[in-house]
Amino acid sequence: LIIGFGISGRHSITVTTVASAGNIGEDGILSCTFEPDIKLSDIVIQWLKEGVLGLVHEFKEGKDELSEQDEMFRGRTAVFADQVIVGNASLRLKNVQLTDAGTYKCYIITSKGKGNANLEYKTGAFSMPEVNVDYNASSETLRCEAPRWFPQPTVVWASQVDQGANFSEVSNTSFELNSENVTMKVVSVLYNVTINNTYSCMIENDIAKATGDIKVTESEIKRRSHLQLLNSKAS
């Protein structure tokens, strides 16, 4: 969490941002809140990015002002206009690119004063893994697949019954570059699995950690998966 204060002649206002991660090829949100004002026309929001000449986005007098927007953000940004009045200056970013990573500044002017806070935005790719029984294999085998990751993650298998066991000798992981030549498909195969056991395929990079679980019994197969972003820190 980054909390910034204004330092102008006018009073300072508190601006709060939260570091976050964007998923390449999806929409992202850069979070920023501030002490609200009673008049929308008195609020100015400016989003800036370190190393970028033009503005990322500007909102003033109740609407977007795009004349100074940098080329790399054209047609890709919007604030939640109906929530500005309650102090939400968060920016929606369309079609996140690897190059969107960096340090952003959320700068606010209201009738109460000015304030700003920085935000670290990481970009990469992360997706939910799906674990299935591979019926084509000669022995009982599990196949864990996740369609989009970047940077290249690590893949670790674990089991409920054999806690702490190292499965690296009985697993094989491959990474296949996707068509846009950035993200990769992750495929990991675990051999010699036993029934009545729960196996977990854990995929992790510096942005996200995802787990796919599978429980195989004689009568049924149960699956569960979840994903957690690793770098959401508030400022």
């Epitope: 998923n23 929409d27 795009l66 004349s67 927007q69 047609g75 919007a78 369309k94 079609n95 068509s179």
Partner: antibody, heavy 120, light 107 residues
Framework: EVQLVESGGGLVQPGGSLRLSCAAS????????MSWVRQAPGKGLEWVAY????????YYSDSVKGRFTISRDNAKNTLYLQMSSLRAEDTAVYYC?????????????WGQGTTVTVSS | EIVMTQSPATLSLSPGERATLSCRAS??????LHWYQQKPGQAPRLLIK???QSISGIPARFSGSGSGTDFTLTISSLEPEDFAVYYC?????????FGQGTKLEIK
């Protein structure tokens, strides 16, 4: 050659449901945002919804929010529009359209459309 | 929501004449304005992107101008195949809106 072929249109009663499909070929489907745009008889174009290249992000026009669901299957190169709680005013030709790759928000390729008629 | 207003609703001209179609946005959209042509029974076709940028395969007689709230599509010398409906589209935000269209008909 880029091709977008819509299907699934037809006659449906008010309150009913319908699923439209759009089969894409001639380009790397999984790299592009895709949209549905509709056109009521004798009227102008109305953007309906978009879905991100990976399928994880969607955005809808206010007129269909909560009733329509856009999705995609990149393995099948297919875009979908699940329409429910249909109203007479949803009667239109529905086009699937590809958004520009570099900077979105304009449509460089369109399908020929599929007709949806909502009537009792 | 940004409202796009096109004028005139109908424009009657003869082949060889110059056509000027207007589009106005309810608020400034910089140059985030795109133009499409639609013929009866066909899908729309992209003509101009970002107010004035030409599209590969589109004849040079089609040009666009404007910024902020006021935009113009110009067809320098009308060909018979140019008679169609023309739409402008706001491309600045997430909720994409079209104008109601200008029908270009033969006089």
């Amino acid at each position: 050659e880029v091709q977008l072929v819509e299907s699934g249109g037809g006659l449906v009663q008010p309150g009913g449901s319908l699923r439209l499909s759009c089969a894409a070929s001639g380009f790397t489907f999984s790299n592009y945002y895709m949209s549905w745009v509709r056109q009521a008889p004798g009227k102008g174009l109305e953007w309906v919804a978009y879905v991100s290249s990976g399928g994880g992000s969607t955005y809808y026009s206010d007129s269909v929010k909560g009733r329509f669901t856009i999705s995609r299957d990149n393995a099948k190169n297919t875009l979908y529009l699940q329409m429910s709680s249909l109203r007479a005013e949803d009667t239109a030709v529905y086009y699937c359209a590809r958004e520009s790759y570099s900077q979105g928000n304009y449509f460089d390729y369109w399908g020929q459309g599929t007709t949806v008629t909502v009537s009792s | 929501e940004i409202v796009m207003t096109q004028s005139p609703a109908t424009l009657s001209l003869s082949p060889g004449e110059r056509a000027t179609l207007s589009c106005r946005a309810s608020q400034s959209i910089s140059d985030y304005l795109h133009w499409y042509q639609q013929k009866p029974g066909q899908a729309p076709r992209l003509l101009i992107k970002f107010a004035s940028q030409s599209i590969s395969g589109i004849p040079a007689r089609f040009s666009g101008s404007g910024s902020g709230t006021d935009f113009t599509l110009t067809i320098s010398s009308l060909e018979p195949e140019d008679f169609a409906v023309y739409y402008c589209q706001n491309g600045h935000s997430f909720s994409l809106t079209f104008g109601q269209g200008t029908k270009l008909e033969i006089k």
